[in-house]
Amino acid sequence: MQKGDQNPQIAAHVISEASSKTTSVLQWAEKGYYTMSNNLVTLENGKQLTVKRQGLYYIYAQVTFCSNREASSQAPFIASLCLKSPGRFERILLRAANTHSSAKPCGQQSIHLGGVFELQPGASVFVNVTDPSQVSHGTGFTSFGLLKL
Amino acid sequence: MQKGDQNPQIAAHVISEASSKTTSVLQWAEKGYYTMSNNLVTLENGKQLTVKRQGLYYIYAQVTFCSNREASSQAPFIASLCLKSPGRFERILLRAANTHSSAKPCGQQSIHLGGVFELQPGASVFVNVTDPSQVSHGTGFTSFGLLKL
Amino acid sequence: MQKGDQNPQIAAHVISEASSKTTSVLQWAEKGYYTMSNNLVTLENGKQLTVKRQGLYYIYAQVTFCSNREASSQAPFIASLCLKSPGRFERILLRAANTHSSAKPCGQQSIHLGGVFELQPGASVFVNVTDPSQVSHGTGFTSFGLLKL
């Protein structure tokens, strides 16, 4: 990617944050070894990465969770990378699913999502999970980011 | 990314190598369909990718392993992407965890890690696992790389 | 990456398509929220991404599948990212393996593959799986793409 005023590097990497909120949208923070290249990408309300420039972006998320088959619903644990663009419907960009473990008290598993998508100015991306209480927030386990091509 | 003497492409992709060493740090080699763009990134001692230029890098690792719940410790299999910078603390950048399988003799699972991080000149990244003897070294199963934005 | 006639952005992201074919090669389509930057990368026969320019590419695939240990073969589910270059042998770039779940009727799991590779003009990449009938084609679950550095 080019460095320069015309075409600066745009990249972000944020770290998961435990939340008391009951929402399925994961919370993130600029803490630890985070990346926020400049104000052309911002973390809004601790929940979404918002870009100012149109273009192609590689967007990724990693979620580690700990669950048990007996204690969880029948449905698998699903992580979804979603897009919100001004004046458009929200949409799912990527999803991954893992069946709960039989390990006790719970079994850890990690999910990685990533892909190239066109984002409009003001577009936001966020990560949804089926059960945020199962997400692991230890160092490096759960993170979210993007880079502009 | 720009091509040119001023801002050459910097990228690497190395292939896992079985090792008799007892260390938890995985070993890598420039073999098979590997990538080493130029001398601005190097594989040192078969264990770490070291960069000469400061900047933002997308760093990734994939580890496939085969383990069995009864034959392994209670703790899950964990893969960690770690950073060593001159005069700084070593640090965990990314981690993924998978509970051992109940399949016999062992059950294969794959982990993928990836994220954007600022690296300083002379910084090195390496991959740690809880049990290197469980790692699968068949073609394409376990690899490690980076690219400079 | 540079924008301009000399060095345009090259990127693709395609979406899985269920297929009645008995081949192990996954089928893809330009549908939903897909990406196809220009004609320097094309989706050929719904099965492979073909590039016109030589260079380093980050190539990735995500496959979600649903399988059961009793109903499947002993062998794990394996996803392979493969390369076909003009006048060369096909080769495996990346593989991931997951042992089948004991969940009934089947347990979902997701695999992510990604790495940096040098591609020649006319090179094609495609994704092979051990059992295409087990692949999940719901929105966002299974996708395939690349970006030129």
Partner: nanobody
Framework: EVQLVESGGGLVQPGGSLRLSCAAS????????MGWFRQAPGKEREFVAV????????LYADSVKGRFTISADNSKNTAYLQMNSLKPEDTAVYYC????????????????WGQGTLVTVSS
């Protein structure tokens, strides 16, 4: 700013043990990690061990793995380095360091440092 005071250094025979302590005061709520570096005579300062405050994750230099253990007592705002099976090559001044909480990957923030404590391993 964080103030760090080390203690526990001294002379020990090869194969012996020592426990170093590092007491933190000041802006301790801003600490992301605490750890140890060492500097032998005529050599550069090198990383020894670190413990991260978020979840107690630890990392060690290859040269001390299996012999040294870092730990922290948050109630006392103190980090410890238990050094076992000491070797003559472990002889150095050991420095405690603290990394501020908001040190993102593009910010090479300054660490806060202690004054150092000398460890000598000799028969």
């Amino acid at each position: 700013e964080v103030q760090l005071v080390e203690s526990g250094g001294g002379l020990v025979q090869p194969g012996g043990s020592l426990r170093l302590s590092c007491a933190a005061s000041g802006s301790i709520d801003r600490i992301n990690a605490m750890g140890w570096f060492r500097q032998a005579p005529g050599k550069e300062r090198e990383f020894v061990a670190v413990i991260y405050s978020s979840d107690g994750s630890t990392l060690y230099a290859d040269s001390v793995k299996g012999r040294f253990t870092i730990s922290a007592d948050n109630s006392k705002n103190t980090a410890y380095l238990q050094m076992n099976s000491l070797k003559p090559e472990d002889t150095a001044v050991y420095y405690c360091a603290a990394e501020p909480y908001g040190s993102g990957s593009s910010l090479i923030s300054e660490y806060d440092w202690g004054q150092g404590t000398l460890v000598t391993v000799s028969s």
